[in-house]
Amino acid sequence: QRLPRMQEDSPLGGGSSGEDDPLGEEDLPSEEDSPREEDPPGEEDLPGEEDLPGEEDLPEVKPKSEEEGSLKLEDLPTVEAPGDPQEPQNNAHRDKEGDDQSHWRYGGDPPWPRVSPACAGRFQSPVDIRPQLAAFCPALRPLELLGFQLPPLPELRLRNNGHSVQLTLPPGLEMALGPGREYRALQLHLHWGAAGRPGSEHTVEGHRFPAEIHVVHLSTAFARVDEALGRPGGLAVLAAFLEEGPEENSAYEQLLSRLEEIAEEGSETQVPGLDISALLPSDFSRYFQYEGSLTTPPCAQGVIWTVFNQTVMLSAKQLHTLSDTLWGPGDSRLQLNFRATQPLNGRVIEASFPAGVDSSPRAAEPVQLNSCLAAGD
């Protein structure tokens, strides 16, 4: 039985901008106006947003119909990008030994391309999704998840790895993006902001959500991540935006209630197995998809990103717990652990539903519809 966890009665952002007032281009914070201190190292080595391709090269993200009573990603209130990261406040941490890949952090040296040259690649993640520019792809069928409802035993490791909280998943969680596109889930982790500041990695028409969940999968064509890195479709990530809602999300509470135990960087605890699919939106049929990269070093490309149209609702208290409990490297709070959005450089974001067509005023404007690359598949 699925636990109710989505806000089902109002469109996304309906409370502030209103269904009739979708986020307009003129409402978007400009790159020049937004602080960039939160951007991770290496961003200065990458093309800036001023180098972004024109609108016709950009993709989009989209909502649900009113009949479904679900959340609409295109009807978003304007939210300022996060500013300066929190000041270091804690001394309860130790340096962890590790390989070069572990010696990176958000918002400081070393530059990410120095940690991994792939971080300076042309097809990186995350990206800004523009629903009006997404290419409707009828070939994109509902995602299939099998074995995601885990029994309480064996317990799973929940770990503060210094840049996120990560849940390691056992073998047997199978996911299919379509016929012959089969994967197994490896781990899930979260990205978040700070008090009053959103921290999702992907954005929708410039809007950043409070947080984002990533479930990382390895193609069954490969035995190991190392063998799949950089190979098209070798890795696939399911991503969903987390938003504030009126009720506690019982699925997420099973993880969030344990964060105090792993406050210190490098610490871990064991949690009973749970329904991993309950951490995701209930609608597996409406999503955006594009090819990008890992959002942290090694930043390998060829990663298939699937971003759900529907969001997941957590209570304000839960979102606060997520952003205010963990500590990272250098005696600092683990906050604002997201990478700046990266240029599309001609990539087209595909949608499994007609995201560029809706009843809002924007639909009446001339829209550049990108063609579906998978139409013949």
């Epitope: 390989d99 770990r159 790895n161 056992p170 490896l186 991540v225």
Partner: antibody, heavy 125, light 111 residues
Framework: QVQLVESGGGLVQPGGSLRLSCSAS????????MIWVRQAPGKGLEYIGF???????YYADSVKGRFTISRDNSKNTLYLQMNSLRAEDTAVYYC???????????????????WGQGTLVTVSS | DIQMTQSPSTLSASVGDRVTITCQAS??????LAWYQQKPGKAPKLLIY???TLASGVPSRFSGSGSGTEFTLTISSLQCDDFATYYC?????????????FGGGTKVEIK
């Protein structure tokens, strides 16, 4: 040439301690997860413990709390510190490298190759 | 905890025979199973990983199959050099308690 060489084995009394070393050459130890495995005389292979690229360690129940895995990246050497040794710890101890380079954040694993030649530890009074 | 049950424990065969060894996991490990060959006084040698992928330099007479909980190692035509002990290694995940386990071994001896 990729190679692992164990050392430090020998005779030790019950309750005693011993530290085994595994010197790596031909690759950078900190880019690979590493495992310790043992084999009692005439018996099968037994998993002891594991260290990830990030330095996190995991152990089999049979040695938890008594054995500690560590590594010195500057010396490209892996260690197994064994305390409170028992007669049943008598075995040949092998270190082995993860088959491919591993990334702490992804937690995947499938096989180990290469292996060291092994070092014999005898626990007896 | 994962347990790997290997059978038979001993197998008598002749050169040229087709030999099959099985390994059963106590819970599903997907395709995360490896096969090793060990000769007396030597370290184990990797033969097969990811259930069916032949390791570099291993003769094609060795093959592996299976997924989930049931796995098989097959030697299509036994050679003199193949008389040894074979172990399966199952990986449920290193971050799980006892999530790595070897089978008890199968000694292939001359009939």
């Amino acid at each position: 040439q990729v190679q692992l060489v164990e050392s430090g084995g020998g005779l030790v009394q019950p309750g005693g301690s011993l530290r085994l070393s595994c010197s790596a050459s031909g690759f950078s130890l900190n880019s690979y997860a590493m495992i310790w495995v043992r084999q009692a005389p005439g018996k099968g292979l037994e998993y002891i413990g594991f260290i990830t690229t990030g330095g996190t360690t995991y152990y089999a129940d049979s040695v938890k709390g008594r054995f500690t895995i560590s590594r010195d990246n500057s010396k490209n050497t892996l260690y197994l510190q064994m305390n409170s040794l028992r007669a049943e710890d008598t075995a040949v101890y092998y270190c082995a490298r993860d088959r491919v380079k591993s990334y702490d954040d992804y937690g995947d694993l499938d096989a180990f190759e290469p292996w060291g030649q092994g070092t014999l530890v005898t626990v007896s009074s | 905890d994962i347990q790997m049950t290997q059978s038979p424990s001993t197998l008598s065969a002749s050169v040229g025979d087709r030999v099959t060894i099985t390994c059963q996991a106590s819970q599903s490990i997907s395709s995360y199973l490896a096969w090793y060959q060990q000769k007396p006084g030597k370290a184990p040698k990797l033969l097969i990983y990811y259930a069916s992928t032949l390791a570099s330099g291993v003769p094609s007479r060795f093959s592996g199959s299976g997924s989930g909980t049931e796995f098989t190692l097959t030697i299509s035509s036994l050679q003199c050099d193949d008389f040894a002990t074979y172990y399966c290694l199952g990986v449920y995940g290193y971050s799980f308690d006892d999530g790595i386990a070897f089978g008890g071994g199968t000694k292939v001896e001359i009939k």
